[in-house]
Interface confidence: low
């Protein structure tokens, strides 16, 4: 951004009203008026080129410094060529000297040369020769000098003539400011340019309305150079949540849009299942019945708990049940559905019901299931079971309603006993069996049926309350078909599969375990 100039003194604009002090009084510098373009112009001129040892001073009025640290002095002047005077005027000069003096008060007409410090010798780039002068075509020179740092309340400038023919048309004194600036959504105030050329004044910016420094970001800063130029921007501001960048400002998100954090991104349209947001929304409120899980980004549509599992079946197989279901018809808009299975049992005789608790076994842990089936085993015979399968997702915890479906099943038979041959001889077979412990209390007796293989006309039955039996009076080297069935108060349970066991031949040794 271009530097801004603040004028402290402008001789040309003052119309001869300034009344500068000349020394010695009445000699040397003189205020003159000319007409240019039908306008009066004023100038201080001196032209004592024929006399030697000139020391003519022109001092400005006292200039209040204000906030300036470094001042710039722009001079517009003409200098006549010494050769344009008769004999070349041996004492003639073509330069003059520029001085300044700082003071805290106006000394008025009390002029003391010793208080002044030389700034520079001012030499023209172009001198006005005789022919130019006669044609009223003077060569105007422009020179600029700067002084700083200034520390007192005010200052004077002085021009020392040492024998030149000079006309001073314009003296303009100003200081420079870096102008007010909006950059990177930060406002930088108008700042006085520093006084030291190498140094850059660091200026802190303030974020525009509704802009903030991003977390971990640098505060906005710029550097104001001596010439009033802004340099080296550092850091930036971003539009805060609910606002987006529009040119150099942060504008509230329009209704129906939102922005959830300070960022460079624009406002986003409210996602599905949100209400029309008001202006400046940082998020879009969910529709009634829809929610956001804590980990959901604001840009994600609002979601709701799933509906119940769509279709649930419980297929009994002896003392086992396979539960199968299909996913909810409405997922709630989420993919993080999990299922949990709970179980109740009811005694038909008493009508009592209670939790299954530890009396059943699941093929996998019954909570947090992602598959849509599970097998429940170790069920008791002649018991009614109710299974509840609940579907949940990431927002189910935000509402009190739950999404579940139930299925009931009656277990009419015990689990088939698992049968093994414990030992055998030429005339006997020792057989044992087991059933799940929860079912054992329901069993009254076990019935063991056996017959010779291939003889379908006759079979033998043995009943026992225990878990083993020895079958005697068997034929040697003969295969028998053996089946065990539990008997409950309500009738027969499921029978075991039919096993083939063979007695030993007479040559074999007795009672060998198979």
């Amino acid at each position: 951004a271009q530097g801004k100039e603040v004028v402290l003194l402008d001789f040309a604009a003052a119309g001869g009203e300034l009344g500068w002090l000349t020394h010695p009084y009445g000699k040397g510098w003189d205020l003159m008026q000319n007409i240019m373009n039908d306008m009066p112009i004023y100038m201080y001129s001196v032209c004592n080129v024929m006399s030697g040892d000139q020391d003519n001073w022109l001092r400005t009025n006292w200039v209040y410094r204000g906030e300036a640290e470094r001042i710039f002095i722009e001079l517009k002047f003409t200098v006549r060529d010494c050769n344009s005077f008769p004999g070349g005027a041996s004492s003639c000069k073509e330069t003059f000297n520029l001085y300044y003096a700082e003071s805290d008060l106006d000394y008025g007409t009390n002029f003391q040369k010793r208080l002044f410090t030389k700034i520079d010798t001012i030499a023209p780039d172009e001198i006005t020769v005789s022919s130019d002068f006669e044609a009223r075509h003077v060569k105007l020179n422009v020179e600029e000098r700067s002084v700083g740092p200034l520390t007192r309340k005010g200052f004077y400038l002085a021009f020392q003539d040492i024998g030149a023919c000079v006309a001073l048309l314009s003296v303009r004194v100003y200081y420079k400011k870096c102008p007010e600036l909006l950059q990177g959504l930060a406002h930088f105030p108008e700042t006085i340019a520093g006084s030291d050329a190498p140094s850059l004044a660091t200026v802190a910016g303030t974020c525009v309305d509704h802009a903030v420094v991003p977390p971990g970001g640098e505060e906005p800063r710029m550097h104001c150079a001596v010439d009033g130029e802004w340099l080296v921007p550092i850091g930036q501001c971003l539009c805060q949540a609910g606002y987006e960048k529009v040119e150099d400002a942060c504008q509230a998100c329009s209704p129906g849009f939102f922005k959830f954090e300070a960022s460079e991104s624009p406002c986003l349209e409210c996602p599905e299942h949100t209400l029309p947001s008001p202006e400046g929304a940082t998020s879009c409120e969910c529709e009634e019945g829809f929610f956001r899980a804590p980990q959901d980004p604001a840009s994600m549509p609002c979601t709701r708990p799933p509906s119940a599992p769509h279709y649930l079946t419980a297929v009994g197989m002896g003392a086992k049940v396979e539960l199968r279901w299909t996913p909810p018809q409405d997922s709630g808009g989420r993919e993080d559905i999990v299922y949990s299975v709970t179980c109740e049992q009811c005694w038909p005789e008493s009508g009592e019901c209670g939790p299954c608790e530890a009396s059943v076994r699941y093929s996998e842990p019954p909570h947090g299931l992602t598959r849509t089936s599970v097998t429940v085993s170790d069920l008791e015979p002649h018991m009614n079971y109710t299974f509840t399968v609940e579907a949940r997702n990431g927002v189910s915890g935000l509402v009190t309603s739950r999404s579940f479906r139930t299925a009931s099943v009656s277990i009419n038979q015990t689990e088939p006993p698992k049968v093994r041959l414990e030992g055998r001889s030429t005339t006997s077979l020792s057989v044992s069996w087991s059933i799940p412990p929860p079912q054992q209390s329901r069993v009254w007796k076990y019935e063991v049926t056996y017959r010779k293989k291939g003889d379908s006309n006759s079979y033998n039955v043995r009943r026992t309350e225990g878990f083993s039996v020895t079958l005697d009076d068997l034929a040697p080297d003969t295969t028998y078909l053996v089946q065990v069935q539990a008997l409950t108060q309500e009738g027969q349970g499921a029978g075991s599969k039919v096993h083939e066991f063979q007695t030993l031949s007479p040559e074999g040794s007795g009672n060998l375990a198979v």
């Epitope: 008001p278 929304a281 940082t282 009634e288």
Partner: antibody
Framework: QIQLVQSGPELKKPGETVKISCKAS????????MNWVKQAPGKGLKWMGW????????TYADDFKGRFVFSLETSASTAYLQINNLKNEDMATYFC???????????WGQGTTLTVSS | DVVMTQTPLSLPVSLGDQASISCRSS???????????LHWYLQKPGQSPKLLIY???NRFSGVPDRFSGSGSGTDFTLKISRVEAEDLGVYFC????????FGSGTKLEIK
């Protein structure tokens, strides 16, 4: 400019019904939730609930479930508060208030004073 | 419900003085979004409440900058840097992080 203009004062007997209106102007009615706030004489402010003007869904604070009904006439940009079976403790000034954000209110109606007296 | 406790109940001030009103909540008002939904209203006699400050420190449009809000968690303060005659009335704090509730009010009056 944005305005919420409520119906005038009401004098009712216990057991009667009152319906207070709140007419909105100067903004898109359906873009802002409308809340209702009760101020009993010499008492503080008590939030009664709000109505989602976009979908017409009312939400009631626990103390205002039952006899209180929020409703809308969207075409007229008007919200209503109806109180059934008036009781003495319903005597108060009722304000409608537009929601700037979740339950903070940038514009309020001038209030409707309800006197319940037998 | 969250209880909002305001102190003092009455605040006599001289015009031009600074005034400070405190509001304490029975639960933290930090919302899951990270925002704190604590607001201040002014109710002048015979008028409806007017929003002054929302979300702790956001001054509402048209509210003079002599009003400022600060605080976090459960403790909040409304400051008026130089009280003017038009500032007199009852100030209410309110929270909407949970079910909305209001403080009992602080009456600002001339000393």
């Amino acid at each position: 400019q944005i305005q919420l203009v409520q119906s005038g004062p009401e004098l009712k007997k216990p057991g009667e019904t009152v319906k207070i209106s709140c007419k909105a102007s100067g903004f898109t009615f359906t873009n802002y939730g409308m809340n209702w706030v009760k101020q009993a004489p010499g008492k503080g402010l008590k939030w009664m609930g709000w109505i989602n003007t976009y979908i017409g869904e009312p939400t009631y604070a626990d103390d205002f479930k039952g006899r209180f009904v929020f409703s809308l006439e969207t075409s007229a940009s008007t919200a209503y508060l109806q109180i059934n079976n008036l009781k003495n403790e319903d005597m108060a000034t009722y304000f409608c208030a537009r929601e700037l954000g979740p339950y903070y209110f940038d514009y309020w109606g001038q209030g409707t004073t309800l006197t319940v007296s037998s | 419900d969250v209880v909002m406790t305001q102190t003092p109940l009455s605040l006599p001030v001289s015009l031009g003085d600074q005034a400070s009103i405190s509001c304490r909540s029975s639960q933290s008002l930090v919302h899951s979004s990270g925002n704190t939904y604590l607001h201040w209203y002014l109710q002048k006699p015979g008028q409806s409440p007017k929003l002054l400050i929302y979300k702790v420190s956001n001054r509402f449009s048209g509210v003079p900058d002599r009003f400022s809000g600060s605080g976090s968690g459960t403790d909040f303060t409304l400051k008026i840097s130089r009280v003017e005659a038009e500032d007199l009335g009852v100030y209410f704090c309110s929270q909407s992080t949970h079910v909305p509730t209001f403080g009992s009010g602080t009456k600002l009056e001339i000393k």
